[in-house]
Interface confidence: medium
């Protein structure tokens, strides 16, 4: 062929048109082509219909072609592998009717910010789905229902803050799940179902250790040998499991599977049996696990905050356990924001007097509690994040910007870590600084109205502010996965102006509840 290299390997006719500065499919390719490489061209848009004459095509590589649009028309009846990685796709084309035999789909390192509910409809043969390195924040709950044969799923290195409870329902063949390097703070109860998941990669998420993490903690304990840290170039079967890689973000990197869960509600007559209906509550000390009960009784229909019932921490070790960093996905609307007191041993709060109710936000519909399987709506348009646009621009550095909130803590992982895209002229502050964190932990999805009518000491005077609160991700390391080098998200930087100088922002104020 005048443009592309043609080679026959066994029964495959392979055509290599990589890096030929092509803007369209070259003419007169062999009609019996089975593998077609079109990587590193300048296609921008591409129509799969142009490949219909190649009825034996089983593998198509369209990676690194600056694709902004893939037109799906016609049918490629035997195409099994499609590589769309490293393009500029902002939406996932609906491939089901065009590619009914697809078994491997790679859309890694594109610009996907969301997936429609029926994104995978018609892809009943799909076995491997790679969505690594996009900008996904949420997933529709029935996303994988059309792909019951799925074996490998990579959602690593996205901006996922939560997962639909039923995401993995019906995926009996799933053996590898890659969720590392996201913004996940909890796993919904029942998420993993009952089937075995041999290889799970969960590290590099800001897991929020509180009463809502107990289902996940128990799953980790029961599946410790199936939790791994990804090492590039190492076959997954040769890796060593490392359940300790899943760490509490709010408790000095304490492994989630060892989280004590002190003060959390237990199953019982007066407890909310919907909260933890998969595993009984336990108190873990070292390697010993013992059942516990607590005298705290909760209203049966209490709505939980993303850090669980917000008073769930044991007061015995608050200094080491209280969260002090922001967690997604607080919307940056100009709503009243209340800073409740830090829960310290020197005041009393009668639990029965606290009620929780969801209140509508001014910009969106009420968001469901993350303990349900309902999808969370897309963030409001005014959410302050650094999401890419078709022509992304990072702010030009200034000579003296504020210090970065990210503190580089070296870990043993062999990959680079993200820092804020905003440049700094001074080193990041030391994590050991005793100064109180200016931005307390914030609630995610649900908006909680707290009505506390019982005894609160004067120290717990509430502070209100109408300043917008934006998002801060925890700094993380990344591990490359599934033969794809890593993507690290930039830190989404939060600003709460002048809070450091506010006399009411006492160290004892820690947790932000939006109203």
């Amino acid at each position: 062929h005048p443009i592309c290299e043609v080679s026959k390997v066994a029964s495959h006719l392979e055509v290599n048109c990589d890096k030929r500065n092509l803007t369209a499919l070259p003419p007169d390719l062999p009609k019996d082509t089975t593998i077609l490489h079109l990587s590193e061209n300048l296609l921008y848009t591409f129509s799969l219909a142009t490949l219909m004459p190649y009825t034996r095509l089983t593998q198509l590589n369209l990676d690194r072609c600056e694709l902004t649009k893939l037109q799906v028309d016609g049918t490629l009846p035997v195409l099994g592998t499609l590589d769309l990685s490293h393009n500029q796709l902002q939406s996932l084309p609906l491939l089901g009717q065009t590619l009914p035999a697809l078994t491997v789909l790679d859309v890694s390192f594109n610009r996907l910010t969301s997936l429609p509910l029926g994104a995978l409809r018609g892809l009943g043969e799909l076995q491997e789905l790679y969505l690594k390195g996009n900008e996904l924040k949420t997933l529709p709950p029935g996303l994988l229902t059309p792909t019951p044969k799925l074996e490998k799923l990579s959602l690593a290195n996205n901006n996922l803050t939560e997962l639909p409870a039923g995401l993995l329902n019906g995926l009996e063949n799933l053996d590898t799940l890659l969720l590392q390097e996201n913004s996940l703070y909890t796993i919904p109860k029942g998420f993993f179902g009952s089937h075995l998941l041999p290889f799970a990669f969960l590290h590099g998420n800001p897991w929020l250790c509180n009463c809502e993490i107990l289902y996940f903690r128990r799953w980790l304990q029961d599946n410790a040998e199936n939790v791994y840290v990804w090492k590039q170039g190492v076959d997954v079967k040769a890796m060593t499991s490392n359940v300790a890689s899943v760490q509490c973000d709010n408790s000095d990197k304490f492994p989630v599977y060892k989280y004590p869960g002190k003060g959390c509600p237990t199953l019982g007559d007066e407890g909310d049996t919907d909260l933890y209906d998969y595993y009984p509550e336990e108190d873990t000390e070292g390697d010993k696990v013992r059942a516990t009960r607590t005298v705290v009784k909760f209203p049966t229909k209490a709505h939980t905050t993303p850090w669980g019932l917000f008073y769930s921490w044991s007061t015995a070790s608050l200094d080491s356990q209280m969260p002090s960093s922001l967690h997604p996905t607080q919307e940056s609307t100009k709503e009243q924001t209340t800073f409740p007191p830090r829960w310290t041993p020197n005041f009393t709060l009668h639990m029965e007097s606290i009620t929780f109710s969801k209140t509508p936000k001014s910009t969106t519909e009420p968001t469901p509690s993350p303990t349900t399987s309902e999808p969370v709506p897309e963030p409001a348009p005014n959410m302050t994040t650094l999401e890419p646009t078709p022509s992304p621009t990072t702010p030009e550095p200034t000579s003296e910007p504020a210090p970065s909130p990210t503190t580089p803590e070296p870990t043993s992982e062999p990959a680079p870590s993200p820092t804020t895209p905003e440049p700094t002229s001074e080193p990041a502050p030391s994590p050991t600084t005793p100064e109180p964190t200016p931005i307390p932990t914030i609630a995610t999805s649900p908006t909680i109205l707290v009505s506390a009518t019982s005894l609160i000491t004067p120290k717990s005077t509430f502070l209100t502010t109408t300043k917008p609160v934006s998002l801060l991700e925890s700094t993380k390391k990344t591990i490359p996965e599934l033969d794809q080098p890593p993507k690290l998200r930039g830190v989404l930087q939060g600003h709460l102006e002048s809070s450091r100088n506010d006399p009411f922002l006492h160290p004892d104020f820690c947790c932000l509840l939006p109203l």
């Epitope: 690194r64 790679d106 170039g233 993200p418 820092t419 990344t478 033969d483 890593p486």
Partner: antibody
Framework: QVQLVESGGGVVQPGRSLRLSCAAS????????MSWVRQAPGKGLEWVAS???????YYPDSVLGRFTISRDNSKNTLYLQMNSLRAEDTAVYYC????????????WGQGTLVTVSS | DIQMTQSPSSLSASVGDRVTITCKSS????????????LAWYQQKPGKAPKLLIY???TRESGVPSRFSGSGSGTDFTLTISSLQPEDFATYYC?????????FGQGTKVEIK
């Protein structure tokens, strides 16, 4: 043709800051990942930072928290903000282009020398 | 991190000689999904920027003479100059772009004998 021109190098004291710029031309800047690679005098090449076309930064541990890579697509310019400079940061800093984040560097600038010395 | 080890660190050769430089990685650079080895070779002359010669182990960059070729797979790679020309005297670096952080070999200096 593709051109990358670095600027902003010079002599700076340890602990101080410096900002490098790289002006790009001859290609669609916003579609490519960009990187900084440095070379200490008489030594080999060392990757310093990369930023994807979508604006996501990446760093090795050696500069993490001190260096910040950024880009301004409207100006076709790449930046490297270097804070808390050390003597071992003395090097020629090259700006380089790559198609995707994990791809080879297909075009390089001529470099700008940064000397950190008291 | 993936370590890249080049050998020899320097060599002397004459115009017309066949020159072979090897590069070893501490782990495989083969992407099993596209069967590409993520290894590149660069040439650098004194006072100049590096120039891309070979990528994905064996693909020549456009404009690079055919006397330069690359081979290998997994962890062992080779750059071959079939007939050394005067303009080829330079330092050559291999680089893995398989797993971040990207790492380079220490370089092989090709000098005139």
């Amino acid at each position: 043709q593709v051109q990358l021109v670095e600027s902003g190098g010079g002599v700076v004291q340890p602990g101080r800051s410096l900002r490098l710029s790289c002006a790009a031309s001859g290609f669609t800047f916003s579609s490519f990942a960009m990187s900084w690679v440095r070379q200490a005098p008489g030594k080999g090449l060392e990757w310093v930072a990369s930023i994807t076309s979508a604006g996501t930064p990446y760093y090795p541990d050696s500069v993490l928290g001190r260096f910040t890579i950024s880009r301004d697509n409207s100006k076709n310019t790449l930046y490297l903000q270097m804070n808390s400079l050390r003597a071992e940061d003395t090097a020629v800093y090259y700006c380089a282009r790559s198609r995707g984040y994990e791809d080879y560097f297909d075009y390089w600038g001529q470099g700008t020398l940064v000397t950190v010395s008291s | 991190d993936i370590q890249m080890t080049q050998s020899p660190s320097s060599l002397s050769a004459s115009v017309g000689d066949r020159v072979t430089i090897t590069c070893k990685s501490s782990q495989s650079l083969l992407n099993s999904r596209n069967q590409k080895n993520y290894l590149a070779w660069y040439q650098q002359k004194p006072g100049k920027a590096p120039k891309l010669l070979i990528y994905f182990t064996s693909t020549r960059e456009s404009g690079v003479p055919s006397r330069f070729s690359g081979s290998g797979s997994g962890t062992d790679f080779t750059l071959t100059i079939s007939s050394l020309q005067p303009e080829d005297f330079a330092t050559y670096y291999c680089q893995q772009h398989y797993s971040s952080p990207w790492t380079f070999g220490q370089g092989t200096k090709v000098e005139i004998k």
